[in-house]
Interface confidence: low
């Protein structure tokens, strides 16, 4: 089998509250029932795993309790939200999708979404 195609937006700007959302869409070659989604951050040639979740088709994604990610799934689309971002977290966020069950196993790797995070300007001092 060929590697599975994964599409994600090229660029996303995080909100002033440090929240960024993007869609990760995969071209499923078969009818998977168990899917694993992983978000990786690449910056300065270093790659770290931001979060990961396994879900059964039709169910919610469940990330670890202390994860900065949340998400929902709809068909072959996963809507991912990353919270608590600061300017230093700017980087390329890669979506990796694995069809875990039933066999055969498929792996798809997106080209990455460049997330830009701008720290909000501090409010000027005010007497009011």
């Amino acid at each position: 089998c060929k590697a599975m195609h994964v599409a994600q937006p090229a660029v996303v700007l995080a909100s002033s509250r440090g929240i960024a959302s993007f869609v990760c869409e995969y071209a499923s070659p078969g009818k998977a029932t168990e899917v694993r989604v992983t978000v990786l951050r690449q910056a300065d040639s270093q790659v770290t795993e931001v979060c990961a979740a396994t879900y059964m088709m039709g169910n919610e994604l469940t990330f670890l309790d202390d994860s900065i990610c949340t998400g929902t799934s709809s068909g072959n689309q996963v809507n991912l939200t990353i919270q608590g971002l600061r300017a230093m977290d700017t980087g390329l966020y890669i979506c990796k999708v694995e069809l875990m069950y039933p066999p055969p196993y498929y792996l798809g790797i997106g080209n990455g979404t460049q997330i830009y995070v701008i720290d909000p300007e501090p409010c000027p001092d005010s007497d009011f």
Epitope: T48, E49, L64, Y101, P104, Y105
Partner: antibody, heavy 124, light 106 residues
Amino acid sequence: EVKLVESGGGLVQPGGSLRLSCATSGFTFTDYYMSWVRQPPGKALEWLGFIRNKANGFTAEYSASVKGRFTISRDNSQSILYLQMNTLRAEDSATYYCARDSLAYPHYYAMDYWGQGTSVTVSS
Amino acid sequence: QIVLTQSPALMSASPGEKVTMTCSASSSVSYMYWYQQKPRSSPKPWIYLTSNLASGVPVRFSGSGSGTSYSLTISSMEAEDAATYYCQQWSSNSFTFGSGTKLEIK
């Protein structure tokens, strides 16, 4: 510089136990899956299992050949990986390697750094 | 569990000769990885994701394949290429290695 150094190998009697250690340095240990691989003398490599990273709850997976007898654990404060081997058999005699499982493109699911190995002999 | 069968088990090549070794999977896999191992040394990652060369690997090496059939090719054999090469795959929470191809220099 990434370094993996195994220790704890030696001679053990059949039915005995042994704990191997893999001291690591040069990378953020909690970010990586870590595997154990063995190689009997003159034979092929055999993957034994891995332990996942922090993002995946540090859970472990094992090959069918050692499941129930071997346990992989990690001390994240000291960046040490362990392999606890119980009920050892003659066929467990091998060089045991620890390896780091890479997450970086294009190395997904490859073992990008290996230790030098530690030898285990199971014999009476 | 997916079984990887490498062939040939042993081969020899003259300097400058083209070398191809194969790795056959018992069922379809998405990617293949290759490692080089020399006597009394640890394995070294050699090819990632079927066709990406690891850092420092000479460009005379290449990898290709899909589904159940993969191969590693050396365009022009050199003495330093003499080693054992292992293929490896990942599928659904388990790694497996092939039986190895030992490549000798004539």
